[in-house]
Interface confidence: low
């Protein structure tokens, strides 16, 4: 009725002194290796010469912190981050951080990363629209409050405001170019 050698489970380590023989009813508790977390019961029990119970260690680590455009990581870089480990970002000049400076590895997933936005409020090129174009030569950067106008290709009708404006680093809603109904 005694049990011999302890069973082995992936990434699980038995706690306490190892013995050659375990008496019936004896319990052994397992702990998980670094980066792993126990899922369910952590014990095995010796019953009728057999071990019952199956400790399961789940990988809760994270790799590759989220990439944040126009930011760099200021905390130490690791190949693998244990659950609870935090990573801090800093925006490159002249970008400003929106959201939280830190992300945390939480049971295998990263918390929400921040965003680095152009604090000057400039905009990139205007968004393209189907069957239409802007009337001026497109630039790579537009100053705050800049406006551009769209025109539709032949046989298409413009719906919405033909002029869009750069506000707080974002363009207002562009118009649509719709095909006219043919009866």
């Amino acid at each position: 009725t005694d049990c011999l050698s302890l069973p082995s489970f992936e990434n699980a380590i038995p706690m306490g002194e190892k013995k050659d023989v375990y008496k019936a009813g004896e319990q052994v508790t397992y702990t998980c290796a670094t980066y792993y977390k126990m899922d369910g019961a952590s014990n095995v029990t010796c019953i009728n010469s057999r071990w019952t119970g199956r400790p399961t260690c789940r990988d809760t680590s994270c790799v590759n912190p989220p990439t944040v455009q126009n930011a760099y990581i200021v905390s130490r870089q690791m190949s693998k981050y244990p659950s609870g480990e935090r990573v801090r970002y800093q925006c490159r000049s002249p970008y400003e951080m929106f959201g939280d400076e830190e992300v945390m590895c939480l049971n295998g997933n990263w918390t929400e990363p921040p965003q680095c936005k152009d604090s000057t409020g400039k905009c990139g090129p205007p968004p393209p629209i189907d069957n239409g174009d802007i009337t001026s030569f497109p630039l790579s950067v537009y100053a705050p409050a800049s406006s551009v106008e769209y025109q539709c290709q032949n046989l298409y009708q413009l719906e919405g405001n033909k002029r869009i404006t750069c506000r707080n680093g974002q363009w207002s809603e562009p118009p649509k170019c719709l095909h006219p109904c043919v009866i």
């Epitope: 935090r86 925006c91 951080m97 939280d100 400076e101 830190e102 992300v103 945390m104 918390t111």
Partner: antibody, heavy 112, light 105 residues
Amino acid sequence: QVQLQQSGPGLVQPSQSLSITCTVSDFSLARYGVHWIRQSPGKGLEWLGVIWSGGTADYNAAFISRLNINKDNSKSQVFFKMNSLQANDTAIYYCARNFGNYAVDYWGQGTS
Amino acid sequence: IVLSQSPTFLSASPGEKVTVTCRASSSVKYMHWYQQKPGASPKPWIFATSNLASGVPARFSGSGSGTSYSLTISRVEAEDAATYYCQQWSIIPPTFGNGTKLELK
């Protein structure tokens, strides 16, 4: 809408501790940090510390020995505790949501 | 970093142009501004030197760099009567200016 509701005593005896709970709504503490700032007629606005989304706290070095900030994300609560209060700690204490780079956008109503 | 605001007190007539200055004891990357009215919590007014917070009228503007920053109201209105604070975050701990109280004549 986004709100930070503060609860705590209005009167603390000298050498005692001040504990304030900041309960937030309409945003997640797992995404935003919460700052603590106080305001007094003598010293104006003073930044005390912040608890980030990941749970790390940063403190003003002038208060680090007697200040503790922690939180419970599941309850949407941030807990502020300052020990060994003296008369010159008399102020309005605010919790406020981090907007980015130590700026804050939403403030609690203040605890006097 | 110590932030010194000037003037401490300002009295202006409606329609007048008003400028509040904030000087830092060392160079800072950006400056934030807050507005506070009596009995209320401060409100964000200008983020990162020149970005107006949501709902702030366009008559307000912010500018500056290095150690000198300013908040300007092109044409003051009665509702602008309040105390304005600057705040830097470049170096921990973040610090606030002593405030500028704007009163309307």
